[in-house]
Amino acid sequence: SAPFSFLSNVKYNFMRIIKYEFILNDALNQSIIRANDQYLTAAALHNLDEAVKFDMGAYKSSKDDAKITVILRISKTQLYVTAQDEDQPVLLKEMPEIPKTITGSETNLLFFWETHGTKNYFTSVAHPNLFIATKQDYWVCLAGGPPSITDFQILENQA
């Protein structure tokens, strides 16, 4: 992947929300839950109502990028998943509205969404070699791969 410095002048323009109210489950069938306000973690749930419901917004790059670039928001809130550094927890950032244009350091709000069958991967635009990941007894964070789990199943239409 191109280093972040090459991507920093790329502009991303919001297009539309492409998915509403979906749940993310990792490869161990753990759901992402909101923990202690601004953190996310993964847990095996008896009650899926405890899982976070996300919305996904699509962005178009000024550089003709074949990758699908998305923002992740907790449904019915103004909280957006924000990347930090490797092995650091992702945080929930409150913003008054979905950003119309994202560039520079704000790209920590964006992820490249890739699908391989039922597996979904979210690579940080700010750190293109790092994925949203779950880790045993830790927060949802950015990681390069094992032992963290980087593939997710998207569960839609959970009543």
């Epitope: 909101r34 923990a35 202690n36 953190y39 973690t41 109502d49 405890e50 449904s75 019915k76 909280l79």
Partner: antibody, heavy 122, light 107 residues
Framework: EIQLVQSGAEVKKPGASVKVSCKAS????????MNWVRQAPGQGLEWMGW????????TYADDFKGRFTFTLDTSTSTAYMELSSLRSEDTAVYYC???????????????WGQGTTVTVSS | DIQMTQSPSSLSASVGDRVTITCRAS??????LNWYQQKPGKTPKLLIY???RLRSGVPSRFSGSGSGTDYTFTISSLQPEDIATYFC?????????FGQGTKLEIK
């Protein structure tokens, strides 16, 4: 089994301080915020605020800023609520309650301690 | 801050009656409304979250509905063990305010 066990009843004189403890068990303490709720005799429930059990950062409702302090001992999964400069109107039952987000957005209090009665009397 | 106005403050009903309590928020709370039951001398217990979702183990005679600013809690057929005070609470944003409570008594 998830449990919140609070310290016993306290009788204090005006001007004194009191520290109520709330020991959690049966879940990962750092994953759920701890709320404090006051109930004066014959009255309703008042949300006092909560403490982030991972960062230790507290949020207080306006009526509970100043004399109230929330703290943690993460090694024993215990939350504390300290109240200084006690007044007669602080006489109440104080509850701790675990906070949970349903769907990641709706905040509720799903497990409660048994309550600690604090009586302030000269 | 979001204010929660609950009514009535008390009500008396007979066993088998349908009982309704209302809760009004000072602004739209997007269905983020929870209901608690507190029996005399006991700790509060979460019954319903997110307007209408029954917590595990809660009898199906309890239900909730509503949207925007107006919400309703219903007991379809009042039982003697339902004698308690019921509180609504908004879960949209802190401070997570409660309604004043509704004390339910048996006629």
């Amino acid at each position: 089994e998830i449990q919140l066990v609070q310290s016993g009843a306290e009788v204090k004189k005006p001007g004194a301080s009191v520290k109520v403890s709330c020991k959690a068990s049966g879940y990962t303490f750092a994953h759920y915020g701890m709320n404090w709720v006051r109930q004066a005799p014959g009255q309703g429930l008042e949300w006092m605020g909560w403490i982030n059990t991972y960062t230790g950062q507290s949020t207080y409702a306006d009526d509970f800023k100043g004399r109230f302090t929330f703290t943690l001992d993460t090694s024993t999964s215990t939350a504390y609520m300290e109240l200084s400069s006690l007044r007669s109107e602080d006489t109440a039952v104080y509850y701790c309650a675990r906070g949970i987000y349903y769907f990641g957005s709706n905040y509720a209090m799903d497990y409660w301690g048994q309550g600690t009665t604090v009586t302030v009397s000269s | 801050d979001i204010q929660m106005t609950q009514s009535p403050s008390s009500l008396s009903a007979s066993v088998g009656d349908r009982v309704t309590i209302t809760c009004r928020a000072s602004q739209d709370i997007s269905n983020m409304l929870n209901w608690y039951q507190q029996k005399p001398g006991k700790t509060p217990k979460l019954l319903i979250y997110y307007t209408s979702r029954l917590r595990s183990g809660v009898p199906s005679r309890f239900s909730g509905s509503g949207s925007g600013t107006d919400y309703t809690f219903t007991i379809s057929s009042l039982q003697p063990e339902d004698i308690a005070t019921y509180f609504c609470q908004q879960g949209k944003k802190p401070p997570y305010t409660f309604g004043q409570g509704t004390k339910l008594e048996i006629k």
